[in-house]
Amino acid sequence: APPRLICDSRVLERYLLEAKEAENVTMGCSESCSLNENITVPDTKVNFYAWKRMEVGQQAVEVWQGLALLSEAVLRGQAVLANSSQPFEPLQLHMDKAISGLRSITTLLRALGAQEAISLPDAASAAPLRTITADTFCKLFRVYSNFLRGKLKLYTGEACRRGDR
């Protein structure tokens, strides 16, 4: 991937809108959109006053940890869907888009050098990732959507600005 492709706002916007659409689609369904289990996902809350002053390396740790857990959660969701006897039709399409989106974002972040931004002290001193649980596909997509427009967007914004200097 081109090193700074993720710095083009249209790229992230595409994934943001896909995530939001998935969330809106699943908002209406209840029974068929239950995960039937609690899946651990990252807590997407951001205290922007504190985040703004975090070292970029610390931000990178939180983003990478969150991305890894979210990818795991979405793959688990896909497994649940595969075992479902009567899956809600549009779900499969949105799950596929989410998995593909998370893979692309991971690749784009690597190209940006986000992993190199994590120094050993940052990784060692990072607080354990705060987590919550998702019990519906809607909540899973909501976390995905929140993560993209929260920590990921804030981090890439800062990392891209630094790269411009």
């Epitope: 943001l16 205290n47 967007k153």
Partner: antibody, heavy 123, light 109 residues
Framework: QVQLVQSGAEVKKPGSSVKVSCKAS????????ISWVRQAPGQGLEWMGG????????DYAQKFQGRVTITADESTSTAYMELSSLRSEDTAVYYC????????????????WGRGTLVTVSS | SYVLTQPPSVSVAPGKTARITCSGD??????VHWYQQKPGQAPVLVIY???ERPSGIPERFSGSNSGNTATLTISRVEAGDEADYYC???????????FGGGTKLTVLG
Amino acid sequence: QVQLVQSGAEVKKPGSSVKVSCKASGGTFRSYAISWVRQAPGQGLEWMGGIDPISGFADYAQKFQGRVTITADESTSTAYMELSSLRSEDTAVYYCARELYYPGTWMAVMAYWGRGTLVTVSS
Amino acid sequence: SYVLTQPPSVSVAPGKTARITCSGDNIPEYYVHWYQQKPGQAPVLVIYRDNERPSGIPERFSGSNSGNTATLTISRVEAGDEADYYCQVFDESSWHWVFGGGTKLTVLG
């Protein structure tokens, strides 16, 4: 129930400073950021800045940078907003608002508001 | 910095539906929150995160965000809904909260 009680109305001279307080009760003071928003007569809402009481980190809107200082005193659960070099255009009602994370939000929203403090700048 | 544009005023008859718009570049990329402010009072949050209602806000209030416009919809409008309404987003590029200019809702009759 969360309540934000603000200090009383002030009349100030141009060039002077004003310090408005906002005392919070109900809930844990340090858990939520406090924002300050002002509203000039007949005008809309304008965000001035906010503070995270845990870290003491404050952030300010570009327009007020250098003129506004927001602080928080955890021992009294009170936030303060000080605006210096006052001019007549600073005549407004100043609100403090406590931010809250609703389920599904990544960014806290202004869920609780004080009643406002009218600051009049006049010579 | 990011700019949100609202119509200065909207008029509606009691019992009808009022729609207040808020436009901005790529607004679906942001979460939009809505506040109601009655004369002489502090603002009250009526919709957060595009379309969610805080407890205590009637179901008549709903929100949407698509295209280049976020919309606050008030169905079966009552005289008590007459107020100024403000949209708000958090602009991640400037790290600032941004409010729209506000819309005065007038309930006719």
